[in-house]
């Protein structure tokens, strides 16, 4: 018999190589059985994660998931970090393992490097 | 059932580059990362980097960068292992590991691809 | 790169007996989601490592109860409670907190 217990997907030490200037959706998918919980995005500050007030956000639905989207339109160098989502259920928080933004200004690059230059390469990134 | 299917042994001559597949069934290789471990004969294992079928993203070992190449073909649940520029010293047994990315839950290896580098 | 040390690298011991195999990390396997990533595989002869054991002590679906694993920050332990002659095999940890994972050199298990 499956668990109830609210899930959130989130790969532990997941991360996303993306630009400033471009639109992008984080999506942080969560599982439940009846009611959908409360769910929340934070951004890490050391070792506290700073709740994100007044961002534009959004659910979506799919088969056996829906997912809380967090709209970065577009990036900004600032982005650039980590992110976590929680989920308020039954009076408990449910907390995501965080992923990472790594966010490189276009304007600081001649062309656009590969993902895996972005996550070997900090020096291309903000901190 | 669970299963990691590797390619078979290859004999490969110094400065060529050996590509090893693995074809995973049982499980969604999205929720996954593919991590590739090697082991040189009577050694212990050596961690190469980890792939998420996911998205592409790759972490590789400092010692692999530049050499190694990870990647995933979701619509046919198979991993793959790139390595060039092979010398004598990379002759052993590669692993393709299949590590649930969200709780740990599940921990799967495959048999191992024997891969002999001689000139 | 975090060091992992075994001790003892190989052991004789008898059926029945209790073994306990060390692992020291070189800094704390602690991530910042307060848990500990290590892993004990075992490994016999011509095989495929299969995990025993993850987050330090949960058991894999279908290990027996007689393997258990503990400890916390840069000290784990593996325990085999009473052995039996499937368990003779080599043992590693593995780590996979911090970037490069790296492994022990290995527990050779042998018959005494």
């Known amino acids: 018999k499956e668990s109830c217990d609210v899930q959130l997907y989130i790969k532990r030490q997941s991360y996303h190589s993306i630009f400033a200037g471009d639109p992008f959706k984080l999506e942080c998918p969560v599982k439940y059985c009846a009611h959908r919980p409360q769910v929340t995005w934070c951004k890490l500050n050391g070792t506290t994660c700073v709740k994100l007030e007044g961002r534009h956000t959004s659910w979506k639905q799919e088969k056996n998931l829906s997912f809380f989207i967090l709209h970065f339109e577009p990036v900004l160098p600032s982005d650039n970090g980590s992110y976590r989502c929680s989920a308020n259920f039954l009076s408990a928080i449910i907390e995501s393992h965080s992923t990472t933004l790594y966010v490189t200004d276009v304007k600081s690059a001649s062309e656009r490097p590969s993902k895996d230059e972005m996550a070997s390469r900090p020096w291309l990134l903000y901190s | 059932q669970v299963q990691l299917v590797q390619s078979g042994a290859e004999v490969k001559k110094p400065g060529a580059s050996v590509k090893v597949s693995c074809k995973t069934s049982?499980?969604?290789?999205?929720?996954?990362?593919i991590h590739w471990v090697r082991q040189a004969p009577g050694q212990g294992l050596e961690w190469i980097g980890r792939?998420?079928?996911?998205?592409?993203?790759?972490k590789y070992a400092q010692k692999f960068q530049g050499r190694v190449t990870m990647t995933a073909d979701t619509s046919t649940s198979t991993v793959y292992m790139e390595l060039s520029s092979l010398r004598s010293e990379d002759t052993a047994v590669y692993y393709c590991?299949?590590?649930?990315?969200?709780?740990?839950?599940?921990?799967?290896w495959g048999q191992g691809t024997l891969v002999t580098v001689s000139s | 790169d975090i060091q992992m040390t075994q001790s003892p690298s190989s052991l004789s011991a008898s059926v029945g007996d209790r073994v306990t195999i060390t692992c020291r990390s070189s800094?704390?396997?602690?991530?910042?989601?307060?848990?500990?990533?290590l892993n004990w595989l075992q490994q016999k002869p011509g095989k495929a490592p299969k995990r025993l054991i993850y987050?330090?002590?949960k058991l894999d679906s279908g290990v027996p109860s007689r393997f258990s694993g503990s400890g916390s920050g840069t000290d784990f332990t593996l325990t085999i409670s009473s052995l039996q002659p499937e368990d003779f095999a080599t043992y590693y940890c593995?780590?996979?907190?911090?970037?490069?994972?790296?492994f022990g050199q290995g527990t050779k298990l042998e018959i005494k």
């Open positions: 590991a299949s590590y649930e990315g969200y709780y740990e839950r599940f921990g799967y």
């Open positions: 593995w780590q996979d907190t911090h970037f490069p994972y790296t």
């Open positions: 049982g499980f969604n290789i999205k929720d996954t990362y």
């Open positions: 987050l330090v002590s």
């Open positions: 800094q704390s396997l602690l991530d910042r989601d307060g848990k500990s990533y």
């Open positions: 792939n998420d079928p996911a998205n592409g993203n790759t």
